[in-house]
């Protein structure tokens, strides 16, 4: 009752290994690391056969098949390159995940290298079987901003891609008869969030209550250059509208808000986020130069006669931008206190502009980002949001524009976006 001699499979072994096998002897067939037992197209770790009474084996010896990790999982905003020839996905093969640069970068500077393990899963030394994360790069426009920058008032056109974080926020309240419509700007912070001024998203009511407009009435345009041609822009509806809980309609204190987009927007040369600053109560230093863009009034001196005879509008069709210095807080406070009217420049605001006037933001620019280039991180950081000014015409002498000091609200912004700050630490100002 002796059974025939057994040959172990290629890349496998038989245990116990004996010279002879008799009735009721059992053997266990297993495979080398990185291989699996294959029997009748079924993969298994081991396979047992037995020597039968009639001197035959209960089954044929199975084969050993190399482990296949199969096609690696898709990485959102990422690419996969195969290190092994013929794009092999078998044991010990290597792949490398990378992010769609320059718009995304890998979280925690991960190598992105994954190896096909003996268990048939792609493994990374740090993340294990978890995929890496591609985070949007911030504050790095695809075009570098020129040093000579004119003003929004009497302004200069912004070339497409200069302000890739610039959003046009259109509010159309169709629940009212007649419909109410206005717009402002905002700044893209991530693929799903827009930062803007609260007064842009406050429902226009007779009283001083602060109620956000309905999300259904908000449309956000990104990658937009000319408001007359929205075909090339990405438009998105709002999933959430979040006003700062302490926004004061009387003095515009805490004039900051967020819009969560219905769907994340694809980033590209004309759509990229701006960086958030670090939490710092001082805000931007006096005399630092910042840039602000918008589709607001670019020629405040055009007469009503000209407007009605030419059929033109007072707002800009093409995105305009201006370079403005931060004004010392005391100087700005004094400037507004000397005016008739109840003007209050709080610690949550800063001013920018020129004593002699001529360069300023204006109606329609509200909510736009005042950005400053951070030399250390080599990124553009949103330090302010266009908030208010006046009472004289925009660009008037000694009438500074007032901006929300974003650095006072960094924690609030992260909290609303539901992102731990550590996740995006490399992106913020150093």
């Amino acid at each position: 009752n002796e059974c025939p001699e057994l040959q172990p499979p290629v890349h496998g072994k038989i245990e116990p290994s004996q010279a002879k096998y008799f009735f009721k002897d059992q053997v266990l067939v297993s495979c080398d690391t990185g291989y699996k037992v294959l029997k009748d197209n079924v993969e298994m770790d081991t396979f047992q056969i037995e020597c039968l009474k009639d001197g035959t084996w209960s089954n044929k010896i199975p084969t050993c098949k190399i482990v296949d990790c199969r096609a690696p999982g898709e990485l959102e905003h990422g690419l996969i390159t195969f290190s092994t020839r013929n794009n092999l996905t078998t044991y010990k093969s290597e792949i490398k995940y990378s992010c769609q640069e320059p718009y995304y970068k890998m979280l925690n500077n991960n190598t992105g290298i994954y190896t096909c393990s003996a268990q048939g899963v792609w493994m990374n030394k740090v993340l294990g079987r978890s995929l890496p994360t591609c985070l949007p790069e911030c504050g790095q426009p695809s075009r570098s901003l020129p040093s000579l920058v004119k003003r929004i008032i009497g302004g200069r056109n912004a070339e497409p891609g200069l302000f890739p974080w610039q959003a046009l926020i259109v509010v159309e309240d169709t629940s009212r008869v007649p419909n109410d419509k206005w717009f402002g700007s905002g700044a893209l912070l991530s693929a799903s969030w827009i930062l803007t001024a609260a007064h842009v998203l406050r429902s226009q009511r007779r009283d001083t209550t602060v109620i956000p407009v309905s999300k259904e009435h908000v449309t956000v345009y990104l990658g937009l250059h000319d408001v007359r041609d929205k075909s090339g822009a990405v438009n998105s509806s709002a999933a959430r509208v979040v006003l700062h809980p302490d926004f004061n309609i009387q003095n515009y204190n805490h004039d900051i808000a967020l819009v969560q987009l219905q769907e994340p927007v694809p980033l590209g040369p004309h759509v990229m986020p701006v960086c958030l600053p670090r939490l710092e109560p001082e805000g931007p230093a006096p005399h630092m130069l910042g840039l602000v863009a918008g589709w607001g009034i670019s020629n405040p001196n055009v007469t009503v006669d000209e407007i009605i005879s030419s059929g033109t509008r007072t707002l800009s069709d093409v995105l305009q931008y201006v370079k403005l210095p931060v004004v010392p807080h005391a100087e700005c406070k004094t400037s507004y206190e000397s005016r008739s009217g109840n003007y209050s420049v709080t610690e949550n605001m800063f001013c920018a502009g020129y004593y002699e006037g001529g360069k300023d933001t204006c109606l329609g620019d509200s909510g736009g980002a005042f950005v400053i280039f951070d030399d250390l991180s080599q990124r553009w950081v949103v330090q302010g949001l266009v908030s208010w000014g006046g009472p004289e015409e925009c660009g008037s002498k000694q009438v500074y524009g007032v901006y929300t000091k974003v650095s006072n609200y960094v924690d609030w912004v992260w909290e609303q976006m539901g992102l731990p700050q550590s996740v995006v630490e490399p992106q913020v100002e150093r």
């Epitope: 009212r176 007779r206 408001v227 009605i308 005879s309 059929g311 707002l315």
Partner: antibody, heavy 124, light 112 residues
Framework: EVQLQQSGPVLVKPGASGKMSCKAS????????MIWVKQSHGKSLEWIGV????????SYNQKFKGKATLTVDKSSSTAYMELNSLTSEDSAVYYC?????????????????WGTGTTVTVSS | DVLMTQTPLSLPVSLGDQASFSCRSS???????????LHWYLQKPGQSPKLLIY???NRFSGVPDRFSGSGSGTDFTLKISRVEAEDLGVYFC?????????FGGGTKLEIK
């Protein structure tokens, strides 16, 4: 609800002046233009002028230049029209009406909301 | 000034019938920007005018779809497909293509 509430009737003697008001509510006053229109008894409508609330800029129908003066008080969301050197020809109902928003891409100049009207009677 | 001529002066109709108002301008109302700024207003007895149609054919919010506007250049028409009692009043056409903006003399819609 968007409303324009006009002041009560004005009764003046010939040669005198008369001022009327138009108080706006239910919308952001400074974002819109305000138009003034005259309707003589049983007659059609005549455009007098327009004021840009945002900065007080005005444009007048040549016929009413020197006759009408348009002003605004932003703090009370009120537009005003003063008529001077009144004659019996100026006896009419005067309407304020809301013009386009500064945010409109096409300043179409139709008037979507009209005031209640102020009757001016010039009589000795 | 652009003269706006409305015909007829008075339009007697039966309730449920169609009404048609004509408005003719002394010069073309096509603006250099391509738009035509011709609008229609209704003034009911003892009330202020109300906007019905703007830029030739666009119904203002809240205006029933029985109202429609058409025309181009110098000839324009307002139609009411089925007249209701609440439609009675004076209908004015108005142009804002040329300064000064002008109104037609009005057509009074009356019940037969």
């Amino acid at each position: 609800e968007v409303q324009l509430q006009q002041s009560g009737p004005v009764l003046v003697k010939p040669g005198a002046s008369g001022k009327m008001s138009c108080k706006a509510s239910g919308y952001k006053f400074t974002d819109y233009y305000m138009i003034w229109v005259k309707q003589s008894h049983g007659k059609s409508l005549e455009w007098i002028g327009v004021i840009k609330i945002y900065n007080g800029g005005t444009s007048y129908n040549q016929k009413f230049k020197g006759k009408a003066t348009l002003t605004v008080d932003k703090s009370s969301s009120t537009a005003y029209m003063e008529l001077n050197s009144l004659t019996s020809e100026d006896s009419a109902v005067y309407y304020c009406a809301r013009g386009p928003s500064l945010y409109d891409y096409d300043p179409y100049w139709y008037f979507d909301v009209w005031g209640t009207g102020t009757t001016v009677t010039v009589s000795s | 000034d652009v003269l706006m001529t409305q015909t007829p002066l008075s339009l007697p109709v039966s309730l449920g019938d169609q009404a048609s108002f004509s408005c003719r301008s002394s010069q073309s109302l096509i603006h250099s920007n391509g738009n035509t700024y011709l609008h229609w207003y209704l003034q009911k007895p003892g009330q202020s005018p109300k906007l019905l149609i703007y830029k030739v054919s666009n119904r203002f919010s809240g205006v029933p779809d029985r109202f429609s506007g058409s025309g181009s250049g110098t000839d324009f028409t307002l139609k009411i497909s089925r007249v209701e009692a609440e439609d009675l009043g004076v209908y004015f056409c108005s142009q804002s293509t040329h300064v000064p903006w002008t109104f037609g003399g009005g057509t009074k819609l009356e019940i037969k």
